[in-house]
Interface confidence: low
């Protein structure tokens, strides 16, 4: 393309560069639904923001296709290892795409944090962090799931969170 | 603004893009002060660098406002769980702003690594990683704190570190 | 340089910005060689991709000098703590440079995950995540090593992975 075209593209790129897509969503009291669905997140208050991405029912929704570094941290904690609780916690980032009914695992961690507690009444804490680069198309969604979510400990949005930015 | 203005901005953007703010600071023998203050960091030797950010008394100081991915890892370790040591380790990234006297929690993890050691003489190791996107204004500072810092194990800057880059 | 020169550079920068180097490599059955060498990775199938970086024998190879956020996660797991297995797992990112024969440690974590298992037949899981910004020259390589790699658990590329992007 000629200089004019290049110029338009450069201006466009500068404008889009100003809003390089990024988001950081924080844990809130409403995050844990107990429904088996994905975690829900705060999108506006405190440290939470959306810039060039949108949010729907726990999902970051991509508006501009590209490669994104996506990340999530969850704070886990409990007292001993109650019977009926899975000894393994699975924390994952999953993709939902309009073209396909199933969620796709993107980044996943398994941990056995309860095993740290050597007595049934001992308080324990653990943290799980995930981050990695994935390609996302416009309209695709990313969600966070934790199984068993009863061990997720929320407080103030600093201990459990979910975010992304285009790289 | 007209083409000339756009041109100037584009040139400016190219120049600033050349120094997209980034930093990686590494743990050193002087990192642990025992004073209750934030951890201190190496800024020049080895793998450490500052590019478009500055450093003061343990803090990364923002010179250009924007959204930053900030991160820190600390290497924890010990022998058994000595009495008097907290069973919970808190590792966090905190913001100091000129407009407000209190530090603000940004990203925090709690872990109970001692619980891994099944005997009082057992050596254990654990690692805590934090990372997330936050908005920072020029002049704001970010620090790392660990409570109880006596369990942080330093060696050569590869195991405990602190960094940021603009997204 | 004059406007023409600047223009050329801007056009060039726009083109290079379109392929801001990034990669995400995933764990595969062939990742664990049992050789003491670095882990090997899937570069094309599924979630894996290379964009402006290349791959050779487990290494991400830099083609464009700059600061890169490099990261890796490995999924660890086992049943109890078999004798002969190191009680400490070391997971690290290492640099190989054409100018120097020895590898340089960049980012390293030590963990004692076996200690979580309070009985010899208990299944345990743990995850180690590393990420940080390092400067890499063209031709330099980054590899992932895990000692003892017998505790790395592979499945489908979502639990153990390795990536980088220029910041």
């Amino acid at each position: 393309d000629g200089p004019a075209g290049s110029w338009e593209q450069l201006i466009q790129e500068r404008r889009s560069h100003e809003v390089n897509p990024a988001a950081h969503l924080t844990g809130a009291n409403s995050s844990l639904t107990g429904s088996g669905g994905p975690l829900l997140w705060e999108t506006q208050l405190g440290l939470a923001f959306l810039r060039g991405l949108s949010y729907h029912d726990g999902a970051l929704v991509v508006t501009k296709a590209g490669y994104y570094y996506i990340y999530s941290k969850v704070q886990l904690g409990g007292v001993g290892c109650p019977l009926g609780l899975a000894s393994t916690i699975t924390h994952g980032l999953y993709k939902r795409t309009p073209r396909y009914p199933e969620e796709l695992e993107l980044l996943v961690s398994q941990q056995s944090p309860c095993g740290r507690a050597t007595s049934s009444s001992r308080v324990w804490w653990d943290s799980s962090f995930l981050g990695g680069v994935v390609h996302l198309e416009a309209g695709e969604k990313v969600v966070v799931r934790v199984l068993d979510e009863r061990l997720v400990r929320l407080r103030d949005g600093t201990r459990s969170y979910f975010g992304a930015f285009m790289v | 603004d007209g083409p000339a203005g756009s041109w100037e901005q584009l040139i400016q953007e190219r120049r600033s893009h050349e120094v997209n703010p980034a930093a990686h600071l590494t743990g050193a023998n002087s990192s642990l002060t025992g004073s209750g203050g934030p951890l201190l960091w190496e800024t020049q030797l080895g793998l450490a660098f500052l590019r478009g950010l500055s450093y003061h008394d343990g803090a990364l100081v923002v010179t250009k406002a924007g959204y930053y991915y900030i991160y820190s890892k600390v290497q924890l370790g010990g022998v058994g769980c000595p009495l008097g040591l907290a069973s919970t380790i808190t590792h966090g990234l905190y913001k100091r702003t000129p407009r407000y006297p209190e530090e603000l929690e940004l990203l925090v993890s709690q872990q109970s690594p001692c619980g891994r050691a099944t005997s009082s003489s057992r050596v254990w190791w654990d690692s805590s990683f934090l990372g997330g996107v936050v908005h920072l204004e020029a002049g704001e500072k970010v620090v790392v704190r660990v409570l109880d810092e006596r369990l942080v194990r330093l060696r050569d800057g590869t195991r405990s570190y602190f960094g940021a880059f603009m997204v | 340089d004059g406007p023409a020169g600047s223009w050329e550079q801007l056009i060039q920068e726009r083109r290079s910005h379109e392929v801001n180097p990034a990669a995400h490599l995933t764990g595969a059955n062939s990742s664990l060689t049992g050789s003491g060498g670095p882990l090997l990775w899937e570069t094309q199938l599924g979630l894996a991709f290379l964009r402006g970086l290349s791959y050779h024998d487990g290494a991400l190879v830099v083609t464009k000098a700059g600061y890169y956020y490099i990261y890796s996660k490995v999924q660890l797991g086992g049943v109890g703590c078999p004798l002969g297995l190191a009680s400490t797992i070391t997971h690290g990112l290492y640099k190989r440079t054409p100018r120097y024969p020895e590898e340089l440690e960049l980012l390293v974590s030590q963990q004692s995950p076996c200690g979580r298992a309070t009985s010899s037949s208990r299944v345990w899981w743990d995850s180690s995540f590393l990420g940080g910004v390092v400067h890499l020259e063209a031709g330099e390589k980054v590899v992932v090593r895990v000692l003892d790699e017998r505790l790395v658990r592979l499945r489908d590329g979502t639990r153990s992975y390795f990536g980088a992007f220029m910041v």
Partner: antibody, heavy 117, light 107 residues
Framework: QVQLVQSGAEVQKPGASVMVSCKAS????????ISWVRQAPGQGLEWMGW????????NYAQKFQGRVTMTTDTSTNTAYMELRSLRTDDTAVYYC??????????WGQGTLVTVSS | DIQLTQSPSFLSASVGDRVTITCWAS??????LAWYQQKPGKAPNLLIY???TLQSGVPSRFSGSGSGTEFTLTISSLQPEDFATYYC?????????FGGGTKVEIK
């Protein structure tokens, strides 16, 4: 410049132990590992094992497993190799070398250990 | 363990000769191979790593090639100071192993 300086020659009786030291200078000790290699009189080179000066992790050749212990002291930038239950065929020059995860770039001058009754 | 077989074990040559030493690995080791030179009473000295990369300070008459299971060290024009024993070493799999050595003697 990089230097590895080893302790002096030793004469030991069968069944005894020997400890050889290797003091490193001229580089950041904890960034790299130390390998130990031995060479019996008139023979080739034999790799004994490796220790990370950083993590203390070790990897010993099967042949020496249970008889050898490699350690490091990061405060003095010194690596140590202890070989126990010495036999006459352990008579050799013992070398420390910087590296082991990749190549053995710098070597100590060697320490002659003689095992004789 | 990976066995490395060097050939020949002994080699007689004259100053100015082109000398080639071969090292075979019992299984593929990609290019994880190094070559060392050792003179009597001295520690080995690194010549080449990653099969073909010349270590800093080593004369350019030394070169290495090969990948997988077969590797060669070539000295393009033998000099008086090159009379020594040469060892190959694989760096891919623990335990690290050395070839049996090739002694280059004056003819």
């Amino acid at each position: 410049q990089v230097q590895l300086v080893q302790s002096g020659a030793e004469v030991q009786k069968p069944g005894a132990s020997v400890m050889v030291s290797c003091k490193a200078s001229g580089y950041t000790f904890t960034y790299y590992g130390i390998s130990w290699v031995r060479q019996a009189p008139g023979q080739g080179l034999e790799w004994m094992g490796w220790i990370s000066a950083n993590s203390g992790n070790t990897n010993y050749a099967q042949k020496f497993q249970g008889r050898v212990t490699m350690t490091t002291d990061t405060s003095t930038n010194t690596a140590y190799m202890e070989l126990r239950s010495l036999r006459t065929d352990d008579t050799a020059v013992y070398y420390c070398a910087k590296g082991g995860v990749a190549v053995l770039e710098y070597w100590g001058q060697g320490t002659l250990v003689t095992v004789s009754s | 363990d990976i066995q490395l077989t060097q050939s020949p074990s002994f080699l007689s040559a004259s100053v100015g000769d082109r000398v080639t030493i071969t090292c075979w690995a019992s299984q593929g080791i990609s290019s994880y191979l190094a070559w060392y030179q050792q003179k009597p009473g001295k520690a080995p000295n690194l010549l080449i790593y990653v099969a073909s990369t010349l270590q800093s300070g080593v004369p350019s008459r030394f070169s290495g090639s090969g990948s997988g299971t077969e590797f060669t060290l070539t000295i393009s024009s033998l000099q008086p100071e090159d009379f020594a024993t040469y060892y190959c070493q694989q760096l891919k799999i623990y335990p690290l192993t050395f070839g049996g050595g090739t002694k280059v003697e004056i003819k």
